[in-house]
Interface confidence: low
């Protein structure tokens, strides 16, 4: 059965997943998806890494730990009740049927106190490649929810957004861990 993790509405949720690279920097592709791990890949991918970098992520999903050392734990920013459910962390070890799959259940509880509205961010500071004009102040803000999804295969048109993210608090926990090599 899935390991269960809890967070309150408006908080950041943390879903731990680790592996030990065979050698420093010798990374294994990892995907995170919403829904239980299917036979192959991840369904409803929210974040993906390749052998060297994070190459796809969606607006509220960040890797907060040192993914270059195998900490691929997922942080979900400013959760809502809709974020409840099963999440799949899939460590895509080369070879047929070698993948390590971890299903983590996220339970979101209503906040004890009514949460503040989604925090506004200076869009220029958060995504400076999108707005090339400097000096934009707080008037040019945008909520997290409207930031675009990003895919490295679309890098020619989305390079602006690719270059930045604002990570949530530095959370650490124990969780799914495997050793590669």
């Amino acid at each position: 059965s899935e390991v269960e993790y809890r967070a309150e509405v408006g908080q950041n949720a943390y879903l731990p997943c680790f592996y030990t690279p065979a050698a420093p920097g010798n990374l294994v592709p990892v995907c995170w998806g919403k829904g239980a791990c299917p036979v192959f890949e991840c369904g409803n991918v929210v974040l993906r890494t390749d052998e060297r970098d994070v190459n796809y992520w969606t607006s509220r999903y960040w890797l907060n730990g040192d993914f270059r050392k195998g900490d691929v734990s997922l942080t979900i920013e400013n959760v809502t009740l809709a974020d409840s459910g099963i999440y799949c962390c899939r460590i895509q070890i080369p070879g047929i049927m070698n993948d390590e799959k971890f299903n983590l259940k996220l339970v979101i509880k209503p906040a004890k106190v009514t949460p503040a509205p989604t925090r506004q961010r200076d869009f220029t500071a958060a995504f400076p490649r999108m707005l090339t004009t400097r000096g934009h102040g707080p008037a040019e803000t945008q909520t997290l929810g409207s930031l675009p999804d990003i895919n490295l295969t679309q890098i020619s048109t989305l390079a602006n957004e690719l270059r930045d993210s604002r990570l949530a608090n530095d959370l650490r926990d124990s969780g799914a861990t495997i050793r590669i090599g």
Epitope: D50, D53, A125, A159, R163, D164, S165
Partner: antibody, heavy 121, light 107 residues
Framework: EVQLVESGGGLVQPGGSLRLSCAAS????????IHWVRQAPGKGLEWVAD????????EYADSVKGRFTISADTSKNTAYLQMNSLRAEDTAVYYC??????????????WGQGTLVTVSS | DIQMTQSPSSLSASVGDRVTITCRAS??????VAWYQQKPGKAPKLLIY???FLYSGVPSRFSGSRSGTDFTLTISSLQPEDFATYYC?????????FGQGTKVEIK
């Protein structure tokens, strides 16, 4: 072994042009970010420009915008810095360095040895 | 642009000393700060990335920490090969900016 090798530096008169090259080996520049950073004699480090070679997406420091152009040829695994309208204050050692697309982790983990550009009449 | 104010600009220390260099960002940069070491006539070398992670191959006497917008590089026991200039850098937003450098000299 990852290596970056700059070339193309030299002495040039104010208003002149130079093209610097940064040849990468041991990794494919596609998917990384290549930065140019300069250091004037006896001074600190100043970021100049960067490029995501896969996309040709570029960024520049205000001090060089409109005068310098960064580019890359992924087939040659090489990045370039075309410097026009050079000024005395552009005199520096120019380094290329490797960075990462995910900006929160975009520290510069490999640097070239540098090439000296001297702008003087 | 984000300013990185580094201090001190220079310091004298002896082998075995504990050395601390600080950098203050003019605004929030999260953990997107790196530290580099540079020796005369050489390119900078990455020591610490994302504020506190030790780069591969760097001796464990080097460490980095963050407190809000203040960042610290610590050398727990200075070795002869550590005499050099150290730079902090923020890579949170464009343009990436460096501190002015701290020269660590032999006392």
């Amino acid at each position: 072994e990852v290596q970056l090798v700059e070339s193309g530096g030299g002495l040039v008169q104010p208003g002149g042009s130079l093209r610097l090259s940064c040849a990468a080996s041991g990794f494919n520049i596609s998917g990384y970010v290549i930065h140019w950073v300069r250091q004037a004699p006896g001074k600190g480090l100043e970021w100049v420009a960067d490029i995501i070679p896969t996309a040709g997406y570029t960024e520049y420091a205000d001090s060089v915008k409109g005068r310098f152009t960064i580019s890359a040829d992924t087939s040659k695994n090489t990045a370039y810095l075309q410097m026009n309208s050079l000024r005395a204050e552009d005199t520096a050692v120019y380094y290329c360095a490797r960075g990462y697309v995910y900006r929160m982790w975009d520290s510069f983990d490999y640097w070239g040895q540098g090439t000296l550009v001297t702008v003087s009449s | 642009d984000i300013q990185m104010t580094q201090s001190p600009s220079s310091l004298s220390a002896s082998v075995g000393d504990r050395v601390t260099i600080t950098c203050r960002a003019s605004q929030d940069v999260n953990t997107a700060v790196a530290w580099y070491q540079q020796k005369p006539g050489k390119a900078p070398k990455l020591l610490i990335y994302s504020a506190s992670f030790l780069y591969s191959g760097v001796p464990s006497r080097f460490s980095g920490s963050r407190s809000g917008t203040d960042f610290t590089l610590t050398i727990s026991s200075l070795q002869p090969e550590d005499f050099a200039t150290y730079y902090c850098q923020q890579h949170y937003t464009t343009p990436p900016t460096f501190g002015q450098g701290t020269k660590v000299e032999i006392k």
